[in-house]
């Protein structure tokens, strides 16, 4: 039975040219995390695997940094980065948990910041 829950940063916004941390946290389960995938719509951004460590997709290597923890840091944000992001936790024996984050990248210098896990 899947007892865990994923807490995410929810809906967040950031300035164009800035950076943001995407963060998910799996709680209420002692399941073993074997891999975490970060995806943007249907594109794979990065994988953190227990055996092999981090892998960043080649097309995002310049703008995506692993961490902190199992999170992902997006840098040099553009308006095109606006959209949905998913953290997908592969666990044993529970199976797969998915969290959703919506990021809005604003042209304006006044971006409303989410409360949790947000970097200034």
């Amino acid at each position: 039975m899947m007892t865990g829950t994923i807490e995410t940063t929810g809906n967040i916004s950031a300035e164009k040219g800035g950076s943001i941390i995407l963060q998910c946290h799996l709680s209420s389960t002692t399941a073993q995390v074997t891999q975490v995938n970060w995806e943007q719509q249907d594109q794979l951004l990065a994988i953190c695997n227990a055996d092999l460590g981090w892998h960043i997709s080649p097309s995002f290597k310049d703008r995506v940094a692993p961490g902190p923890g199992l999170g992902l840091t997006l840098q040099s944000l553009t308006v095109n980065d606006t959209g949905e992001y998913f953290c997908i936790y592969h666990t044993y024996p529970d199976g797969t948990y998915t969290g959703r984050i919506f990021l809005e990248v604003l042209e304006s210098s006044v971006a409303e910041h989410g409360a949790r896990f947000q970097i200034p």
């Epitope: 399941a31 073993q32 995390v33 227990a50 055996d51 044993y92």
Partner: antibody, heavy 118, light 107 residues
């Protein structure tokens, strides 16, 4: 049944490299990372590194980066670890261990006692 | 590198007693932890994987628990064949460090 066969002992001269073998049988050799572990007499276990037989992907403990080289021969289901320039500090039992992804299964060899002595 | 701090280093107990061995990781290892038993002159044997799961053939008196950075191995109603050394090992990235070991001796 599953077996990881290792020579019982190797006597090595200081400075003369030695290649330890570990022959696997009874399980899918390419499905398990082959790990190597060092244990000095009366001491704990030290993880040296691991190699994935399917593609020879290797992860090495940085403490052993100048000491150990891991290879595999898929055709004979055998893993090897070469120890370079052995000194008395390298005298120990060396285990090979086929360990499934994320530690979900483990098959251990009986270990090879390496004695470095002139 | 992740450090694994295992305690106690040694334990003197009687048959029938219950013992608990703990392992603390220097950072979150997300339940990627195994426990091994090693008897004198023999190779280690897997007791617990994924922090709390027992492989086939391991007696149910053994149990593993924990999450995050804190893990423990509990042995209920200790049998004479349980005496030996116990090690934890993490499986979150590399190097896959072992704990320093716990030597379980007969009182």
């Amino acid at each position: 049944q599953v077996q990881l066969q290792q020579p019982g002992a190797e006597l090595v001269r200081p400075g003369a490299s030695v290649k330890l073998s570990c022959k696997a049988s009874g399980y899918s050799f390419t499905s398990y990372w082959m790990n190597w572990v060092k244990q000095r007499p009366g001491q704990g276990l030290e993880w040296i590194g691991m190699i994935r037989p399917s593609d020879s992907e290797t992860r090495l403990n940085q403490m052993f980066k100048d000491k150990a080289t891991l290879t595999v021969d898929k055709s004979s289901s055998t893993a090897y670890m070469q120890l370079s320039s052995p000194t008395s500090d390298d005298s120990a039992v060396y285990y090979c261990a086929g360990i499934h992804d994320y530690g979900h299964g483990a098959y251990w060899g009986q270990g090879t006692l390496v004695t470095v002595s002139a | 590198d992740i450090q694994m701090i295992q305690s106690p280093a040694s334990l003197s107990v009687s048959v029938g007693e219950t013992v608990t061995i703990t392992c603390r990781a220097s950072e979150n290892i997300y339940s990627n932890l195994a426990w091994y038993q090693q008897k004198q002159g023999k190779s280690p044997q897997l007791l617990v994987y994924a922090a709390s799961h027992l492989p086939d053939g391991v007696p149910s008196r053994f149990s593993g628990s924990g999450s995050g950075t804190q893990y423990s191995l509990k042995i209920n109603s200790l049998q004479s064949e349980d005496f030996g050394s116990y090690y934890c090992q993490h499986f979150w990235g590399t190097p896959r460090t072992f704990g320093g070991g716990t030597k379980l001796e007969i009182k």
